[in-house]
Structure formats: C-alpha cells, structure tokens
C-alpha cells in the first residue's frame, strides 16, 4: 500500500476526518445509500466501499475532505490485499482445521448473531 | 435457515464435532487446502467454505461426521443470508456514515492489522 503511515494509524486518522467532515457529507438530503442491516461489517466491505464511491461522487472536493476519501481508498486497497491473501497458501488439512476452528471460535464469541 | 437450533448453538456444536472428528479428517496426508495468511476470517468466508467442500469430498461419510458437514453447510447458508443483507436497505447519508464509523471503529479495535 503506497502510504507512509501504518494501516492502523490510517484508520484512526480516517475516523477523525469522518467526524470533522460529517456536516459537509450529510448536506445532500435526498441521497440514499445501501446500508447493511447487521453488524458483521467484514462481510459487507464491497457494499461499504460502493457506498463510499457514491458519497464521494456527490461531495464537493477540496481541502481535507479529499484526504478523507484518499484514506478510504487506501483502506480499501489494504482490504483488497487481505482478500487476495485468503487463498494464498495451500496447507495441510491440520492447518486448515486449525483455521476453521479459529473462524468458528470467532463466530461464536465475536459475531453479532441475531436469533 | 432450515434448522431447529439457533445459529449460535449450531456453531458451538460444530466446534465440538470438529474436535471429535479431527483424527479422521487429517487422515489424508497429501491433501492441500488453501488457508488464509491473516486472521480477519470474515474476509475469507468463500475460501473457507471452498476448503470445507474439498475436505468433505475427501472424507469417508457416515455417522456424526455427516452431521459435522451438514452443520457447516447450515453455517454457510447463514453467512450467505448475512451477505445478502449487506445492500438490502437504502438509507440516508447520516445512517451510512454511522455504519461507516462503526466499521472503521471495529477495524481499529478488533481487526488483526499486521504492521
């Protein structure tokens, strides 16, 4: 990712910029954007970034709001990179089962599972 | 999901079945399955379930190991349902920004971001 700051710092900065520019971003009263109806955000990265694209095209650019969308684009690059790494290594069944166990463990403890 | 037990209970039961059948599942010494090289499991659900399919096709069925793969198939159905809900509702910019802020907050606190 062509960024001088680590992704974790990039996310923090983006959160701050989002708060700063909120008033400007919500100026369009008529715009509607798809919003996921659950809290398992990682499952919805494509839709989130499509929404960001819609918002960017409707927002007057300039100053630090440009920085916000640049950051969001770098975060997208990071996530796309992570997605590429999903099938990168072919490992033994043992390793796959460890990962599957980890995945189900995370589902069990961290996912928001509505009854 | 056509299952009598809630998804959370299904996940717990599947974790237990995975431990029970581990020895049988790892019997194939030569089989290689793609394993993600990071810990952000939700980004890799497609690859994980492709791997489960590969494993199932190589595993002698019968008894409770069948129950394991049935459970995993129900979990996949649940996740596919969640993915469909990613773009289900078109909301105002305000709501989208709330969700985006939440997403970045989760990235900031819960994602495993390697330097």
């Amino acid at each position: 990712i062509p960024t001088e700051i680590p992704t974790s710092a990039l996310v923090k900065e983006t959160l701050a910029l989002l708060s700063t520019h909120r008033t400007l971003l919500i100026a369009n009263e008529t715009l509607r954007i798809p919003v996921p109806v659950h809290k398992n955000h990682q499952l919805c990265t494509e839709e989130i970034f499509q929404g960001i694209g819609t918002l960017e095209s409707q927002t007057v650019q300039g100053g630090t709001v440009e920085r916000l969308f640049k950051n969001l684009s770098l975060i997208k690059k990071y996530i796309d990179g992570q997605k590429k790494k999903c099938g990168e290594e072919r490992r033994r069944v043992n390793q796959f089962l460890d990962y599957l166990q980890e995945f189900l463990g995370v589902m069990n403890t961290e996912w928001i599972i509505e009854s | 999901i056509p299952t009598e037990i809630p998804t959370s209970a299904l996940v717990k039961e599947t974790l237990a079945l995975l431990s029970t059948h581990r020895t049988l599942l790892i019997a194939n010494e030569t089989l290689r399955i793609p394993v993600p090289v990071h810990k952000n499991h939700q980004l890799c659900t497609e690859e994980i379930f492709q791997g489960i399919g590969t494993l199932e096709s190589q595993t002698v069925q019968g008894g409770t190991v069948e129950r394991l793969f049935k459970n995993l198939s129900l979990i996949k159905k649940y996740i596919d349902g969640q993915k469909k809900k990613c773009g289900e509702e078109r909301r105002r910019v305000n709501q989208f920004l709330d969700y985006l802020q939440e997403f970045l907050g989760v990235m900031n606190t819960e994602w495993i971001i390697e330097s």
Epitope: E89, R90, R91, R92, N94, Q95, L97, D98, Y99, Q101, E102, G105 | L15, S19, V35, P36, V37, H38, K39, I112, E114
Partner: antibody
Amino acid sequence: EVQLLESGGGLVQPGGSLRLSCAASGFTFSSYAMSWVRQAPGKGLEWVSTISGSGGSTYYADSVKGRFTISRDNSKNTLYLQMNSLRAEDTAVYYCAKERYNWNYLHYWGQGTLVTVSS
Amino acid sequence: DIQMTQSPSSLSASVGDRVTITCQASQDIINYLNWYQQKPGKAPKLLIYSASNLETRVPSRFSGSGSGTDFTFTISSLQPEDIATYYCQQYDNHPLTFGGGTKVEIR
C-alpha cells in the same frame, strides 16, 4: 511493540518438575498461536511445543510428549510450559515465540529462560 | 518427520564477500521455510519468511530463494555485524524442524 518475557527457569533435579511462563504484550494475544523452542548449551534450536490461539489445538515434539504440557491463559496474556519428569537432556535455554500468521509460528522470540537439570 | 540439512556448518569470509548457505528438506515443503539469525547470547531473529520474503526492517543485503526441497540464503555483501549463526526452519508440518545451523565468521 511486541514483547515476550519468559520466567520460571532454574536448577532442578532429574525427575523433578518446573513451570515456565511467558508474559506477552503489544499484540492481541488470543489471536495468535504460541510456541516453545529450546536450545541446549552450544547446540542448535529444537522446537518443543505449540498451542493455537484459543488453546484448542496443541502439538508436541516426540522428545517431550507425555512429560510436558503447554497451556495459555488468554485473560492474563500468558503462555505456560509445565515440565514434569525432567531429564538431564532437557537442560537448555527455553524461548517462547509468537506466530507471524497461521502456522508460520516463530516470528517474535522472547529472550529465553535457562533450565538446568542436574543432581 | 521432515529433516532439514543445512550446509556448510561453518564458514569464514571477508567483509564485502557474498555468502551463501543452503538448506535441503527431506520432502517437498513448497515454500514454507524461514531463515533466522542468532547472535551469541541472544534470541533468534526472523530474517526471511516463506523462503524469499524479507522481514520488516531487515537489511536488503539478506535474501532467500528456492522452493520444494532446495533453498538458499544469501548475504550479498558481508558486514561485521553479520557475525552470527544462521538457521533454516520448515513450517510445512509438525514437528517444526530446524537445520543444524551455519556459523558465519569474519576472516
């Protein structure tokens, strides 16, 4: 910054027991598998044991199987190695190590703790 | 178990020399191989992972190559601070196994 600090080493008689600890900080401990590796004086490195992030999977070298037990307390960010029925050949510096990502285990290493088994 | 045969066991070279260490696995390990540097009295330090990837903040004079069973570790221009023992290690399967080590000295 990732930090791993081993403790619990010392002198013990053959047949005795010892429990090593490794205090971890600077990363999400419960998300990573952890390992123990040892090095006898003047010798090379030997992997001892690994435990997955949740503690659900454990692996051991044949040389320690049935005598050593690896465990972890994710609420305390601490890794353990319970060593029983110790032998002279278990004398070594014991290092704990954090995985880089799935199954690429030995990324960051602690500075090690010396275990001496002698009468 | 997968055996890792590392050679040479020791070598002596001059500052600026190119140094090569080889590691052979007893079976195909794809590219699941790490290289470590260990200085006297210190813990090992990861230099190369997945056979050829340079770990963050490791000088670019270090490199790794190979796949399957044959792997090579290279120091393109030996520096005084590179005096250490170098180990290869496979992580294809348990038990994880190391090469016997190569002690690098300055001539």
